[in-house]
């Protein structure tokens, strides 16, 4: 909407016009060979917005290094045009910009925490919901399916919208929407189970808008290692929000004496966060060099975007790898607590469970491990990638591949250890999950590198769709189905209950190895696909005319 260096708070149509005018002036200057422009200097030879300087500022319209001298710019000045001295003028950066972008990333990460907090608050009180509405297991499965399916269907739609319209407005509307729906769902009378199912579907739509669009804004605010760090913070929100969701669900229920109140916490926080996003998150233009933004929007159809993404081998392989991660996390999250409970029954350290919830203690421990390993994985992955980038250009997919293959080993060891030592099994889960989660932020970063900015929301959406479709939408059911199939051909005993589920879960490490292979395949094409994306950005940076959409 406007140049960040010049204004971090003001927004509106007038600034949009002025920024457009300035862009046109800058392009003419760039074509004449000018080195910089307005407050948003043109990129050097480093490639599409990728600068060697650690102090680089990612703006709406490109990247610029921090001005070493001179007074700070005037915050609140509407757009670059008002302050630019000419096509080649270099504008100093206001002191608040770094903080502004940091605040924007923090708010977006907070929104992601709330997204998952809301999702897992429901998980935390699911037994109470089941009890209250008289929901059978197939009904609980329906609630999960409705959520995931609506999320999957909505994600590509928001991807399309996110690449073409004001993203922060879509984000805020998404948060306001799911907050309102979740809050309303806490008042659904007992007889209207179908309304509860509908509300989960609507929440899935609201949350899809956030998961699809928010990472792309972070991608436009930062570059290189800073972007990796910020995406790490953003994706750490997943385990943090999930863990907090469980805690919020159970603690609010206990404090209020009624599970309904658990569903009223995240919506209130959601409304606040949605408002903060509207106020504090800059309405960034897509891409390091916003010169390409409007033109690309006008030129490419959704179908063309999809074709380009499907032809992008790094994107396709990393998406398939993400599906493998999703498959494993979905299946393990659902079945590991019960598997460990059955292991304890076999070891005679626990009683056979006749009345659910079975393995409640194991669920709690597993939840805590997931929360912590999520944090550790994201930090480890980001750190390893940062270090490996000094050695090789293929660092991102290679770190992911190593993480996946290492994870597969430890997931296999869970089933070996569980037979004799529950503590050993938990250690294997800890290491396995840490390695599995190490690729969360890196996968997002890979996408940012190999997909041009104006296709990123669509790319995130499509990746989200495929990872759910091929991953956690079906994996819990598939594992249960295989386990039941094995049990049907064996005698009914606690040992076979344990073994059948273990054999079924062995599918997970195989899928994870497959994911590792996909990351290795990504590594083969990563450098060329990244270069192609940068080349496209550079080509589109100087089109003949500006088109306003």
């Amino acid at each position: 909407m406007m140049c960040l260096e010049c204004a971090s708070a003001a927004a509106g149509g007038a600034e949009e016009e002025e920024a457009d005018a300035e862009r046109r002036r800058r392009r003419r200057g760039a074509q004449r060979g000018a080195g910089g422009s307005g407050c948003c200097g043109a990129r050097g030879a480093g490639g599409a917005g990728v600068s060697a300087a650690g102090d680089e500022v990612q703006t709406l319209s490109g990247s610029v290094r921090r001005a070493p001298t001179g007074p700070p710019g005037t915050p609140g000045t509407p757009g670059c045009a008002a302050t630019a001295k000419g096509p080649g003028a270099q504008q100093p950066k206001p002191a608040s910009l770094g903080r502004g972008r940091g605040a924007a990333a923090a708010i977006l990460s907070l929104g992601n925490v709330l997204n998952y907090l809301d999702r897992y608050t429901v998980a935390g009180v699911l037994l109470d919901i089941q009890q209250h509405f008289g929901v059978k297991d197939r009904g609980a499965g329906l609630l999960q399916s409705v959520f995931i399916c609506s999320f999957m269907v909505a994600a590509p739609i928001f991807g399309y919208l996110g690449d073409r319209f004001n993203r922060k407005v879509i984000l805020s509307c998404g948060i306001f929407f799911w907050s309102a729906v979740t809050f309303s769902s806490s008042f659904i009378p007992q007889q209207y189970f179908w309304l509860l199912a509908l509300s989960r579907g609507l929440v899935g739509i609201g949350e899809a808008s956030y998961s699809t669009i928010a990472p792309t804004i972070i991608g436009d605010l930062f570059t290189k290692n800073t972007r990796t760090l910020m995406l790490s913070v953003f994706y750490f929100a997943i385990p943090l929000g999930s863990g907090l969701g469980y805690i919020t669900g159970s603690s609010v229920k206990q404090a209020a004496g009624d599970w309904h109140w658990a569903l009223r916490v995240s919506p209130v926080l959601g409304m606040i966060t949605g408002t903060l996003i509207l106020i504090l998150v800059p309405a960034t233009k897509r891409g390091h060099a916003d010169q390409l933004g409007d033109q690309l929007k006008a030129r490419t159809s959704w179908l063309r975007d999809m074709k380009a993404l499907i032809r992008n081998r790094s994107y396709v392989f990393s998406s398939l790898a993400t599906s493998a991660v999703s498959f494993a996390t979905g299946a393990l999250g659902m079945w590991i607590p019960l598997y460990l409970h059955r292991a304890q029954v076999v070891q005679k350290t626990a009683e056979t469970c006749n009345s659910p919830p079975c393995g409640a203690k194991d669920s709690l421990i597993f939840g805590a491990i997931t929360c912590f390993t999520g944090f550790l994985g994201v930090v480890t992955g980001a750190g390893a990638t940062r270090w490996c980038r000094l050695k090789t250009q293929r660092a991102d997919p290679l770190v992911c591949a190593v993480g996946m293959l290492g994870s597969a080993i430890f997931i296999c060891l869970i089933f070996v250890a569980a037979k004799s030592s529950i503590v050993g099994a938990y250690i294997c889960i800890f290491v396995g999950e840490t390695l599995l989660f190490s690729n969360w932020a890196i996968t997002a970063d890979i996408l940012m590198y190999v997909v041009i900015p104006t296709r990123r929301a669509t790319a995130v959406a499509l990746q989200s769709f495929t990872s759910h479709l091929l991953g956690d939408a079906g994996s819990p059911y598939l594992i249960g189905f295989i386990s039941d199939l094995i049990r049907q051909s064996t005698k009914d005993s606690p040992l076979w209950e344990f073994l059948s589920l273990g054999y079924a879960l062995m599918l997970c490490p195989f899928v994870v190895v497959l994911g590792g292979m996909f990351f290795l395949a990504t590594a083969l094409f990563f450098v060329s696909d990244r270069a192609r994306a940068e080349q496209q950005v550079n080509q589109l940076a100087m089109p003949p005319a500006s088109v306003k959409v």
Epitope: K136, G139, Q190, Q191, F193
Partner: antibody
Framework: EVQLVETGGGLVRPGSSLKLSCATS????????MSWVRQAPGKGLEWVAL??????????NYAESIKGRFTISRDDSKSRVYLQMNTLRDQDTATYYC????????????????WGQGVMVTVSS | DIVLTQSPPTLSVTPGESVSLSCRAS??????IHWYQQRSNESPRLLIK???QSIAGIPSRFSGSGSGTDFILSINRVESEDFSVYYC?????????FGPGTKLEVK
């Protein structure tokens, strides 16, 4: 037509055991939640126990007054629900009704849409 | 546990009159209340579910209303077969509980 027929009642001494049985027909028993409700002579209705279907892991819920003494169970192959009553007390004297919960495939109502004719259990020394 | 209070314990009416039976819950229970009729020496039968939803085969003169803590069972123009005991039941939370009943008798 939905039918619920209770059997197994009678006169027993305090501290002894008794098992009530409820034979059902006219509906898909395996998908349906079942309960026992009792009524002491001249008194109101009191819910005793509930057993859910196999899709809810045949989970059982009990009233506080009988918890630990009574056990509800089901046999889907015979379309029967049982109430095993141990350590019977004088205050357990009542007519015991077998009841059905209305089923909606994905969920079930907690109210009772069909009742058996009831069976009398008398606990007296 | 949620306690249900029914009033009055006994209600004397003449056939053709319209009556309202009350049921009050000890806490808000939305619309999770159900009404049963028990004639002398018979099993109870379901009249109204979820405060106001009618049941197939039950005469239309029976209707229910209310939400939260206060609920009403209305009988429009009482007929001779309606003289019996009426119970309300809550299903908002376990344990499932019944009210003590209201006996409808001939005046």
């Amino acid at each position: 037509e939905v039918q619920l027929v209770e059997t197994g009642g009678g006169l027993v001494r305090p501290g002894s055991s008794l098992k009530l049985s409820c034979a059902t027909s006219g509906f898909t028993f395996s998908d349906t939640w079942m309960s026992w409700v009792r009524q002491a002579p001249g008194k109101g209705l009191e819910w005793v126990a509930l057993i859910k279907d196999k899709n809810s892991n045949s989970e059982a819920n009990y009233a506080e007054s009988i918890k630990g003494r009574f056990t509800i169970s089901r046999d889907d192959s015979k379309s029967r629900v049982y109430l095993q009553m141990n350590t019977l007390r004088d205050q357990d004297t009542a007519t015991y009704y077998c009841t059905r919960h209305e089923d909606f495939y994905y969920y079930s109502g907690y109210y009772f849409d069909y009742w058996g004719q009831g069976v009398m259990v008398t606990v007296s020394s | 546990d949620i306690v249900l209070t029914q009033s009055p314990p006994t209600l004397s009416v003449t056939p053709g009159e319209s009556v309202s039976l009350s049921c009050r819950a000890s806490q808000g229970i939305s619309t999770s209340i159900h009404w049963y009729q028990q004639r002398s020496n018979e099993s109870p039968r379901l009249l109204i579910k979820y405060a106001s939803q009618s049941i197939a085969g039950i005469p239309s003169r029976f209707s229910g209303s209310g939400s939260g803590t206060d609920f009403i069972l209305s009988i429009n123009r009482v007929e001779s077969e309606d003289f019996s005991v009426y119970y309300c039941q809550q299903t908002y939370s376990l344990p499932l509980t019944f009210g003590p009943g209201t006996k409808l008798e001939v005046k």
